[in-house]
Interface confidence: medium
């Protein structure tokens, strides 16, 4: 259907209330530095005009597409050049372009501080004084600091923020309330980033065809009842969608994300029998239960994949005349029956199916061929399996410091030119696949494991695509989405590195070290761990535990000091001197 | 679910033609691996032909390649059996198969198949 008005379809779509959120969420990623006022005066003018053209779509300029209207509108603000230098440049650029460009300039480092919340009254105060524009300002610091973050989803979490402010501000003890409550989400929404950037990056580097293929496997998994024509449509649906909100095209990615929604509740007696629940909330919680909603039972009476995909004399004509459903299939095939295994793995095992009938198709007697081809899928299965089992087992002797220290100094030796805070972020993310996947059943670990890994290590790509500066980085980012982890856990120690010059002042402590949160001293001993393997990358890991060791000592010998400052100032010369000592 | 009705079976001459009918309820024919089997008395049931859900890839047993055709009519969301040039040994219950959600038919092994119709008789005989 085609509508007179683009931007008078989306805001009846939405609602005001989503409508506003989602265009405050969309300025705010593309607008990383301009202040909160700024972004809640341009929000405000794109409703209002909304809500004109709504009431008449022939109204002035009402006919203008999404783009051009969001676009002149950021190409008002006034600080433009001064804030964002080169983005000024989009502006003299027209459509589609000029929205092209301003998504090349999203920033996924900007580097604001951390949010720090302040005391809980205070909060309270503003919470009960202005409510919406309190989420507003929700919604702006996650959107600036996570320019792609997937913006229905977003809306979803400032509505769980409102909720725990209006449970916890009429507590008794609103700081033992809010606290636990607030971490858990600020956790889930870190998480939720990060997914979707993945999710981004797939789209963006490596195509739909590669999304696709990871949907089909995700959603085989998940909805195993379902036939592959069902969750086809699906996946077609959700690429849809992903491309929208990746793409900066927020208002039609939640419209259609509740499209989406909408028909799996009304089909879904041919997709799972766990939606039932979802299906009765109002549509934000709709769509973010049917995104979580746990597995399906498998049916019970599957047959063998061989006789599909091996046995039949007609596997190379099935897969010649249309290759990617014939893989699809398998695909789908494959994951619905191995819920335990991760998605890059079903993904390598789909790739090595086909590699093996591109070879096989091309003999004389294909089926002698590609006979044994599922039992050439067992080293392929066991190297996930050896991974988690081992890292879990050193996880679980270390603890979660202990095993983020010993993947820091796996990750520097394996890439010493990557930027320290780049590789303490990474490395403590990596760390905390322990504590997310250690702790779950043997069935459950690969999957968890290694598909958070995937989503981990996606950040160090992206991180590192900004600036370059380790090939082999470059290499294991680029060649192939699915062979990322293996090809990070591949890396040997990189001889090629020259040491880096001592410098004193990295290894300068002061007393400021004493005050800091617990998760925060960890990021300073571990900063300190990464540049003195960049100095000395020939430590074995008995000197860097030494090392270590005595660190930790003189941070607590001395926060405990009547002279914190002074024992700082004499005591950690010595100490690096010694650690020089030691690590000759 | 899936129901499938087969028509159009009768007694022809050898040499002359007849056209099947399958119209199937509760799915899409178009997502569907559908397929037409057949059954001599006394004997196994056998592949006849197929055609794959959302490609139009067609499968034929060697004895009646050439002879019969298999097509649907997604918007009637039926599927048929052209056959021509009948032979006696042609007589058979011909039963219309389905695999929902299977995008090609992988397989002639009727076990394969989920969903069956009732079947219709075809005679050839002088």
């Known amino acids: 259907e085609a509508y007179k008005s683009e931007i008078a379809h989306r805001y009846n779509d939405l609602g005001e209330e989503h409508f506003r959120g989602l265009v405050l969420v969309a300025f705010s990623q593309y607008l990383q530095q301009c202040p909160f006022e700024d972004h809640v005066k341009l929000a405000k003018e794109v409703t209002e005009f909304a809500k004109a053209c709504a009431a008449e779509e022939s109204g002035a300029n009402c006919d203008k597409s999404l783009h051009t209207l969001f676009g002149d509108k950021l190409c008002t603000v006034a600080s433009l050049r001064d804030k964002y230098g080169d983005m000024a440049d989009c502006c003299e650029k027209q459509e589609p372009d000029r929205n092209e460009c301003f998504l090349a300039h999203k920033d996924d480092n900007p580097g604001f501080p951390p949010l720090v919340a302040p005391e809980p009254d205070a909060l309270c105060a503003a919470f009960q004084d202005n409510e919406q524009l309190f989420l507003g300002k929700y919604l702006y610091e996650i959107a600036r600091r996570h320019p792609y973050f997937y913006a229905p989803e977003l809306l979803y979490y400032a509505q769980q923020y409102k909720g725990v402010f209006a449970e916890c501000c009429q507590a008794a003890d609103k700081a033992a309330c809010l606290g636990p409550k607030i971490e858990a989400l600020r956790e889930k929404v870190l998480l939720s980033s990060a997914k979707e950037r993945f999710k981004c990056a797939s789209l963006q580097k490596f195509g739909d065809r590669a999304f696709k293929a990871w949907s089909v496997a995700r959603l085989s998994q998940r909805f195993p009842k379902a036939d592959f024509a069902e969750i086809s449509k699906v996946v077609t649906d959700l690429t849809k969608v992903h491309k929208e909100c990746c793409h900066g095209d927020l208002l039609e990615c939640a419209d259609d994300r509740a499209d989406l929604a909408k028909y799996m509740c009304e089909n879904q007696d041919s997709i799972s029998t766990k939606l039932k629940e979802c299906c009765d909330k109002p549509v934000l919680e709709k769509s973010q239960c049917l995104a979580e909603v746990e597995r399906d039972e498998l049916p019970g009476d599957l047959p063998s994949l061989a006789a599909d995909f091996v046995e039949d004399k007609e596997v190379c004509k099935n897969y010649q005349e249309a290759k990617d459903v014939f893989l699809g299939t398998f695909l789908y095939e494959y994951a619905r029956r191995h819920p335990e295994y991760s998605v890059s793995l079903l993904l390598r095992l789909a790739k090595e199916y086909e590699a093996t009938l591109e070879k096989c198709c091309a003999t004389d007697d294909p089926p002698t061929c590609y006979a044994k081809v599922l039992d050439e899928f067992k080293p392929l299965v066991d190297e996930p399996q050896n991974l988690v089992k081992t890292n879990c087992e050193l996880f679980e002797k270390l603890g979660e410091y202990g095993f983020q220290n010993a993947l820091l100094v796996r990750y520097t030796k394996k890439a010493p030119q990557v930027s320290t805070p780049t590789l303490v972020e990474v490395s403590r993310k990596l760390g905390k696949v322990g504590t997310k996947c250690c702790k779950k059943p043997e069935s459950e670990r690969m999957s968890c494991a290694e598909d958070f890994l995937s989503v981990v290590l996606n950040r160090l790509c992206v991180l590192h695509e900004k600036t370059p500066v380790s090939e082999r980085v470059t290499k294991c980012c680029s060649e192939s989405l699915v062979n990322r982890r293996p090809c990070f856990s591949g890396l040997e120690v990189d001889e090629t590195y020259v040491p880096k010059e001592f410098n004193a002042e990295t290894f300068t402590f002061h007393a400021d070290l004493c005050t800091l949160p617990e998760a925060e001293k960890q990021v300073k001993k571990q900063t300190a761990l990464v540049e003195l393997l960049k100095h000395k990358p020939k430590a074995t890991d008995e000197q860097l535990k030494t090392v270590m060791g005595d660190f930790g000592a003189f941070v607590e010998k001395c926060c405990a000091a009547e002279n914190k400052e002074g024992c700082f100032s004499e005591e950690g010369p010595k100490l690096v001197a010694a650690a020089q000592a030691a690590l000759v | 679910e899936v129901q499938l009705l087969e028509s159009g079976g009768g007694l022809v001459q050898p040499g002359g033609s007849l056209r099947l009918s399958c119209a199937a309820s509760g799915r899409y024919i178009d997502e569907t691996a559908v397929a037409w089997f057949r059954q001599a008395p006394g004997k196994e049931r056998e592949f006849v032909a197929g055609i794959g859900g959302g490609v139009d890839i067609t499968y034929y047993a060697d004895s009646v390649k050439g002879r019969f055709t298999i097509s649907r009519d997604n918007s009637k969301n039926t599927l048929y059996l052209q056959m021509n040039s009948l032979r006696p040994e042609d007589t058979a219950v011909y039963y219309c198969?389905?695999?929902?959600?299977?995008?090609?038919?992988?397989?002639?092994?009727?076990?394969?198949?989920?969903?069956w119709g009732q079947g219709t008789l075809v005679t050839v005989s002088s």
């Open positions: 198969a389905a695999r929902p959600g299977r995008p090609l038919i992988t397989s002639k092994v009727a076990d394969l198949y989920p969903y």
